[in-house]
């Protein structure tokens, strides 16, 4: 069974998938469509890297631009380095500026909804 066939079989169960499962899927050539991606749990999407999202979505990654103001894409963008987002070639804006340090302060993030940044 190839990645696309596997994805069709599990598609209906993906809404509650944890980050670990999404990372594993990104290695299997599944080409997840945008509609499915938009239904994923935000907390499961946030830890994914730009490279992992690119592999997870395949050609569907082109659709991220139209969804950049909507969750979970909007919140995911805020967590990525702008340099990494730039590699997607879509003009996605709102990432962490180059040279900034991300502090993983869970309480701070829970209160503000955004990661804590230290400037250069």
């Amino acid at each position: 069974m190839n990645g696309s066939e596997y994805f069709v079989k599990i598609q209906s169960f993906l809404g509650g998938a944890p980050t670990e499962d999404l990372k594993a899927l990104s290695q299997q050539n599944v080409s997840m469509d945008l509609a499915t991606f938009m239904k994923l749990r935000t907390d499961a999407v946030l830890p994914l890297t730009v490279a992992e999202v690119q592999k997870l979505l395949g050609p569907h990654v082109e659709g991220l631009k139209a969804e950049e103001r909507h969750r979970p894409v909007r919140d995911w963008i805020l967590r990525q380095r702008q340099d990494d987002l730039d590699t997607l070639g879509l003009g996605l804006q709102g990432g962490i500026p180059n040279g900034y340090l991300v502090l993983d302060l869970s309480m701070q993030e829970a209160l503000s909804g955004t990661p804590c940044l230290l400037g250069p």
Partner: antibody, heavy 121, light 107 residues
Framework: EVQLVQSGAEVKKPGASVKVSCKAS????????MHWVRQAPGQGLEWMGN????????YYNERFRSRVTMTVDKSTSTVYMELSSLRSEDTAVYYC??????????????WGQGTTVTVSS | DIQMTQSPSSLSASVGDRVTITCKAS??????IAWYQQKPGKAPKLLIH???ELQPGVPSRFSGSGSGTDFTFTISSLQPEDIATYYC?????????FGGGTKVEIK
């Protein structure tokens, strides 16, 4: 003003390869993927694939996957489409097209002027 | 891949006539369809996107409607300059597909 300027007409023999260029200007080149569409004489439009100008990653229509190669030169804001093992059925006008990402995956709002490729022995 | 079936493949109408072209998608594409006009030797020109949104500068005699799988493109009053071939494009999928085209001629 957005402009997509393509290379000139080509005449090739069966079995040869052709490389068509598309030079972009008037916008941030790395913010939009570039697509290629072809049109055989008297026929409709056929999507061939696209390329991410930022990292050079292409996605191809399955029909052309074994014969097409899309590349990018960021320094000159130019994308290239190379088609190999040419046959007479590849005689067509080849267009580059830029999408606008207003909704979903984006529709094409700007097109190159087209490059005529003739395959004949 | 999503197939786009466009009809008719050609039509002949008189100046002032109402002209209707349809495109049927092989699966639900929401409203993600665009319509293009192409004249001989020229690149396609975008007329309508998102089913019914007219591009700036495009005359209001052009319109579009539909959703899901069935879409309609209409020229309310055909003009001599509208002689061209018209194509639909679905962009609900990253692997874009076009309809087969409709050649519009004047009687």
């Amino acid at each position: 003003e957005v402009q997509l300027v393509q290379s000139g007409a080509e005449v090739k023999k069966p079995g040869a390869s052709v490389k068509v260029s598309c030079k972009a200007s008037g916008y941030t080149f790395t913010n939009y993927w570039m697509h290629w569409v072809r049109q055989a004489p008297g026929q409709g439009l056929e999507w061939m694939g696209n390329i991410n100008p930022s990292n050079g990653g292409p996605y191809y229509n399955e029909r052309f996957r074994s014969r097409v190669t899309m590349t990018v030169d960021k320094s000159t804001s130019t994308v290239y489409m190379e088609l190999s093992s040419l046959r007479s059925e590849d005689t067509a006008v080849y267009y580059c097209a830029r999408p606008y990402y207003g909704s979903s995956y984006g529709y094409f709002d700007y097109w190159g002027q087209g490059t005529t490729v003739t395959v004949s022995s | 891949d999503i197939q786009m079936t466009q009809s008719p493949s050609s039509l002949s109408a008189s100046v002032g006539d109402r002209v209707t072209i349809t495109c049927k998608a092989s699966q639900d594409i929401n409203k993600y369809i665009a319509w293009y006009q192409q004249k001989p030797g020229k690149a396609p020109k975008l007329l309508i996107h998102y089913t019914s949104e007219l591009q700036p500068g495009v005359p209001s005699r052009f319109s579009g409607s539909g959703s899901g799988t069935d879409f309609t493109f209409t020229i309310s009053s055909l003009q001599p300059e509208d002689i061209a071939t018209y194509y639909c494009l679905q962009y609900a999928n990253p692997l874009r597909t076009f309809g087969g085209g409709t050649k519009v001629e004047i009687k």
